[in-house]
């Protein structure tokens, strides 16, 4: 019988008392085979973290700063359940730390030196740790003691709770630096008042502070937010302009064998029976003998943290950067305006080989990081382990939802002004063998399908989106008798046709022979009835253009396209017989790396792009014998996006809507995790 006990860690006598009450009340409402609570008392949160890591306890609720500590080795804990605030309809699990300024003040984030600052309090998250952590490497040396460095960075501050004797400049704007509401500039509202009164130039608060203090839009319009990319935005655009997105209060558990499903089962049942307004006898979110015991008194309920989410992703790149800077206190030697090497994310073995070759040829401008799947690469770019990669539109969507931005687009047509003219896109098509003459778009049910990969544009999002509109359910593995759609669940019929050996079967990378455009076409040639690819795939792999044994004798004339009206056309008539127009593949990165990735890639393509004539003796960025490694092999150049610099603008409203409709069929664990952070 599996042990269904969750050992909750308490950090005080009062918490232990509440925990015992929690245990007893749960016993009275949960069947004997359901989850139960046991209580473990420790002296501090750090002791609780160590106890969970050592398997002496299972769960504890922590503030964001402690979630970071819990994540660090050797603890390796992960977030499993989040408290939420507000209503069930609009649950808030995060708040945003922001920098508020007056509209007419004219400076940006990188011009804060010499300004006057208003803080909620020394050592507090939004008011001190996050802004000072992000500014850390701009502070004058020596950076220790930190208060002295901050005092020398700003021309005056109000940082309540600071030592006014040792650091008088930190109390210059609020004499005495009082650490309670007796100081009119203490806390969120106090820091905002410090700005409003004209004492300071910038207030470090949270996103709701301005709405809690100013009821009129006309008054709020006198203020703006400073964004990390050195722009400003209106105060209601905090989701796109903040210093960090911070989780409010989170239950953590072990990453391996951490009972996360059991913890969720327990807390979900607990909120049903003892949540807000549920029971007079015991209330989960109430602390008669103290404040915020076990859980925050202000919480309204719990939400399950998606399993794909580790602590780094949950806390977010900006928060982790700020806290790491403060804790470790390390900065690059002398900060220069020069770009650091771009860390390119390479998928599996084949891409890594090409990337290493690129790295050597780039003389240190490019470094390589490996991952097994596209989603793993996106996650690495999010958390700073990697910087960039080129993605199919379907993954540009996921990357965008995860906060990344497109920076350059692959162009596939030769033109005089390639780098300045991003193309409208390519065509997603359905290819069949000419010999299967009875096959049309309308009778694909029960046939064998070949896809580039789950979540990709031409191979999945477009055809499956169209199919979903027809069949109104997500059971595509029942619609086709079998197929190869790399990235599907291994036991799915959509992995049955795949050719990868052992663990590589159906993997969404080049270790699966039927992965990508060329792989999906090969699947059609060897086993399938229909392949969902791009309009260039057939000509690129027929007529001797692909020398691989399976392709070298293929003839374009032996294949036809399925049109949406139920007819068929020759391959060259793709412009009048396609499923949809697909956005070109694009390079994505984090917002903070956008300028450097743009600059370095443009240099790199001038050195190794289409202008290189002999690829046998020289490195060619856009060549890999039809394997589309790192970039599509038919890329002519990487083009500027001009104003299409967000994933929505780049992909276009129609495609975003189409992928959004398919979201209900999504198996993307990363998309689930990212929409948890930003619904």
């Amino acid at each position: 019988v599996p042990d269904k006990t969750v050992r909750w860690c308490a950090v005080s006598e009062h918490e232990a008392t509440k925990c015992q009450s929690f245990r007893d009340h749960m016993k009275s409402v949960i069947p004997s085979d359901g989850p139960s609570v046991a209580c473990v008392k420790k002296a501090s949160y750090l002791d609780c973290i160590r106890a969970i890591a050592a398997n002496e306890a299972d769960a504890v609720t922590l503030d964001a700063g402690l979630v970071y500590d819990a994540y660090l080795a050797p603890n390796n804990l992960k977030p499993v359940v989040a408290e939420f605030y507000g209503s069930k309809e609009d649950p808030q699990t995060f708040y945003y730390a922001v920098a508020v300024v007056k509209k007419d003040s004219g400076f940006q984030m990188n011009q804060l030196r010499g300004k006057k600052s208003c803080h909620t309090g020394l050592g507090r998250s939004a008011g001190w740790n996050i802004p000072i952590g992000l500014l850390y490497c701009d502070l004058p040396e020596p950076r220790k003691p930190l208060e002295k460095a901050v005092a020398n960075f700003f021309s005056g501050s109000c940082a309540p709770c600071a030592d006014g004797t040792d650091f008088p400049q930190l109390c210059q704007l609020c004499p005495g630096c009082g650490c309670s509401t007796l100081n009119q500039y203490f806390g969120y509202s106090g820091a905002f008042k410090c700005l409003k009164d004209g004492a300071g130039d910038v207030a470090f608060v949270k996103h709701s502070t301005i709405f809690e203090n100013l009821a009129n839009k006309a008054d709020r319009d006198q203020y703006e937010l400073l964004c990390l990319d050195n722009t400003r935005k209106p105060v209601d655009e905090y989701k796109d302009c903040h210093l960090a997105q911070v989780p409010s209060h989170t239950v953590v558990a072990r990453s391996m064998g951490g009972k996360e499903d059991l913890i969720w089962e327990l807390l979900n049942q607990a909120q049903e029976h003892f949540g807000k307004d549920k029971s007079k006898e015991f209330q989960l979110f109430s602390s008669p003998h103290g404040k915020d015991l076990l859980f925050k008194d202000s919480a309204h309920g719990f939400l399950k943290v998606p399993p794909r989410m580790d602590a780094k992703m949950y806390l977010g790149y900006e928060y982790v950067t700020a806290i790491r800077n403060l804790r470790e206190g390390t900065c690059p030697e002398a900060p220069t305006d020069e770009c650091k090497p771009v860390k390119w994310c390479a998928l599996s073995h084949h891409e890594r080989l090409k990337c290493d070759e690129w790295s050597v040829n780039s003389v240190g401008k490019i470094e390589c990081v490996s991952a097994e799947t596209t989603e793993d690469c996106i996650a690495k770019i999010m958390n700073g382990e990697a910087d960039a990669m080129s993605l199919d539109g379907g993954f540009v969507y996921i990357a965008g939802k995860c906060g990344l931005v497109p920076v350059l687009a692959e162009n596939y047509n030769k033109s005089d002004n390639c780098e300045d003219t991003p193309e409208a896109g390519y065509f997603a098509i359905a290819v069949v063998k000419k010999s299967a003459s009875d096959l049309t778009w309308d009778n694909l049910k029960g046939k064998k399908s070949c896809h580039t990969a789950v979540g990709r544009t031409a191979g999945w999002n477009i055809p499956m989106g169209l199919l979903y509109n027809k069949i109104n359910h997500c059971r595509f593995d029942e619609f086709f008798s079998e197929g190869c759609a790399p990235g599907s669940k291994k036991d799915s019929s959509l992995c049955k046709l795949c050719m990868g050996s052992g663990l590589n079967l159906c993997e969404p990378n080049n270790k699966e022979g039927y992965y990508g455009y060329t792989g999906a076409f090969r699947c059609l040639v060897e086993k399938g009835d229909v392949a969902f690819v791009k309009h260039q795939t057939v000509p690129q792999n027929t007529g001797g253009k692909n020398p691989d044994p399976w392709a070298k004798n293929l003839n374009e004339k032996d294949y036809e396209l399925l049109c949406l009206d139920g007819t068929r056309k020759p391959v060259e008539e793709y412009a009048n017989c396609h499923l949809a127009r697909a956005p070109n593949h694009a390079v994505v990165t984090r917002k903070d790396k956008e300028a450097c990735v743009h600059k370095i890639l443009r240099q790199q393509q001038h050195l190794f792009g289409s202008n290189v004539t002999d690829c046998s003796g020289n490195f060619c960025l856009f060549r890999s014998e039809t394997k589309d490694l790192l970039f599509r092999d038919d890329t002519v150049c990487l083009a500027k996006l001009h104003d299409r610099n967000t994933y929505e603008k780049y992909l276009g409203e129609e495609y975003v809507k189409a992928v959004g409709n398919l979201r209900k069929c999504s198996t993307s664990s990363l998309l689930e995790a990212c929409t948890f952070r930003r619904p």
């Epitope: 507000g86 203090n213 209601d236």
Partner: nanobody
Framework: DVQLVESGGGSVQAGGSLRLSCAAS????????MAWFRQAPGKEREGVAA???????TYTDSVKGRFTISRDVAKNILYLQMSSLKPEDTAMYYC?????????????????FGQGTQVTVSS
């Protein structure tokens, strides 16, 4: 979630006064913005006045100078003092609350409403 219960409505002559009250079951993040709405027969519900967590207020033009919104945070009660009442103020008055993720004057974002209290102003 938060429960809101209004009281204080009634019938009054034009030029008279009324004070509406609204008791909130809990004081929480989702009551940081509170407002009064009204709905006259055959018309859409409209925002009348709102108050932010720390007391800043906003009014729709038609009631400025006549109505005052206030709140007692300790008791979780919202008030609307209405004076110089006019027949066109006749309506069902609702108390509402929302989280401070947008302006308290953004009436379309209010998510929780009470059952309402009737105010009738006769000439």
């Amino acid at each position: 979630d938060v429960q809101l219960v209004e009281s204080g409505g009634g019938s009054v002559q034009a030029g008279g006064s009324l004070r509406l009250s609204c008791a909130a079951s809990i004081y929480t993040y989702s009551t940081a913005c509170m407002a009064w709405f009204r709905q006259a027969p055959g018309k859409e519900r409209e925002g009348v006045a709102a108050i932010a967590r720390y007391g800043d207020t906003t009014y729709t033009d038609s009631v400025k100078g006549r109505f005052t919104i206030s709140r007692d945070v300790a008791k979780n009660i919202l008030y609307l003092q209405m004076s110089s009442l006019k027949p066109e103020d006749t309506a069902m008055y609702y108390c509402a609350s929302k989280s401070p993720n947008s302006g308290c004057d953004e009436y379309a974002h209010y998510e929780t409403f009470g059952q309402g209290t009737q105010v009738t102003v006769s000439s």
